[in-house]
Interface confidence: low
C-alpha cells in the first residue's frame, strides 16, 4: 500500500484469476479507478475496473484467461497497481509486487453431495474448483456442520490435513435437518488464506427405526 490509510490486498486463485480489494480512508469520490496487472515475464497485461463494495473499499477481479488455464507459475512476479484518473492522467494510488503463489486463495469447493446417509451418520463428498495441478496433494480442508438452534460461528471446525474430498460425519441425531460447508487451503504460500466457504449442503438424517436404536 502507498500509505497508512490505504490497503491493497490481492489473492490468486492458482489458475487464471487475481481478486483485489483496495480500501482507503477519504478516497476520492466519483473517480474512475482500476487495477493494472503487469507480469515480469509474460507478454500480457490486464486491467479491471474497481467497483465499490462499501463506503471506503473497492474490489475487482483480474480475469487472466480461461478459468482452468494455468496463467502464472511459482516464479512469476506481477506488479499490481491501483490507478485512479485525475483529469487526463492516471495516478498511482497503491502498488505491490505480487508473488501469486505466496498469496493464494482458492475458489470455494463445489458439487457437494450426500453419498450416503443413515440415522447417525452422513458421508459427504465435494470437488475443488480451478485448483492448480502444481499443488498435487498438498491441500487441506476445513468443514463445519450447522445443527438446529445453532449458528455457523458456533459450529466446531473439522480439519482434514490432506487432500481428502469427502468426510463421514458421525454422532448425528436421527431425523434431523443439518447443513454442511467446506473450504480449502493450499499448504504453499506465506500469505495464503482459506477459500470462501462452499455453498451450504442441506441434508436430513434418517429417522430411527421404531423399537431399536441404530
Amino acid at each position: 500500500a502507498v500509505n497508512g490509510t490505504s490497503q491493497f490486498t490481492c489473492f490468486y486463485n492458482s489458475r487464471a484469476n487475481i481478486s483485489c480489494v483496495w480500501s482507503q480512508d477519504g478516497a476520492l469520490q466519483d473517480t474512475s479507478c482500476q487495477v493494472h496487472a503487469w507480469p515480469d515475464r509474460r507478454r500480457w497485461n490486464q486491467t479491471c475496473e474497481l467497483l465499490p463494495v462499501s463506503q471506503a473499499s473497492w474490489a475487482c477481479n483480474l480475469i487472466l484467461g480461461a478459468p482452468d488455464s494455468q496463467k502464472l507459475t511459482t516464479v512469476d512476479i506481477v506488479t499490481l497497481r491501483v490507478l485512479c484518473r485525475e483529469g487526463v492522467r492516471w495516478r498511482v494510488m497503491a502498488i505491490q509486487d505480487f508473488k501469486p503463489f505466496e498469496n493464494l486463495r482458492l475458489m470455494a469447493p463445489i458439487s457437494l453431495q450426500v453419498v450416503h446417509v443413515e440415522t447417525h451418520r452422513c458421508n459427504i463428498s465435494w470437488e475443488i474448483s480451478q485448483a492448480s495441478h502444481y499443488f498435487e496433494r498438498h491441500l487441506e480442508f476445513e468443514a463445519r456442520t450447522l445443527s438446529p438452534g445453532h449458528t455457523w460461528e458456533e459450529a466446531p471446525l473439522l480439519t482434514l490435513k490432506q487432500k481428502q474430498e469427502w468426510i463421514c460425519l458421525e454422532t448425528l441425531t436421527p431425523d434431523t435437518q443439518y447443513e454442511f460447508q467446506v473450504r480449502v487451503k493450499p499448504l504453499q504460500g506465506e500469505f495464503t488464506t482459506w477459500s470462501p466457504w462452499s455453498q451450504p449442503l442441506a441434508f436430513r438424517t434418517k429417522p430411527a427405526a421404531l423399537g431399536k436404536d441404530t
Partner: nanobody
Framework: QVQLVESGGGLVQAGGSLGLACALS????????MAWFRQAPGKEREFVAS????????DYVASVQGRFTVSRDNNKNTVYLQMNSLKPEDTAVYYC????????????????WGQGTQVTVSS
Amino acid sequence: QVQLVESGGGLVQAGGSLGLACALSGDVFVRYTMAWFRQAPGKEREFVASVTDSGRTTDYVASVQGRFTVSRDNNKNTVYLQMNSLKPEDTAVYYCAANTDYFQIRSLDRNTWGQGTQVTVSS
C-alpha cells in the same frame, strides 16, 4: 508541492565513474515513476533512464545501456543514477524527473523537474 533535489554532479575523466542522487519531497515517493534526462549545450533535453514506481522495471536510452544503472530506494525517497565508463559526449546538465502517470515518463511537458546538476567528462 513536489520538490526534486539532485546531487552528485561534478568533473570526471573519461572512463571514470560518477553517481547522481535525487530526493523527492512533498508527496508519497512510491506514487512516482522516476527518470533521468540530460541536456548538453545547444541540444534538446533527452531521456536517459527511468525506473518504475516499484523499482522492478528500468529503461535506458541505447547510448548508455550497459554503462549507466538507474535504481531507487523507496524508504529513502531517492532515485540514483550510477554512471560508469563515462565518455566526453556524456557531458551535460542531468535532470531528475518524476511523473505519477507511469505511461508518460518520457514526456518532457508532463514531468516534475529538479533543478539539474552539471556532469563534465574531460578527455
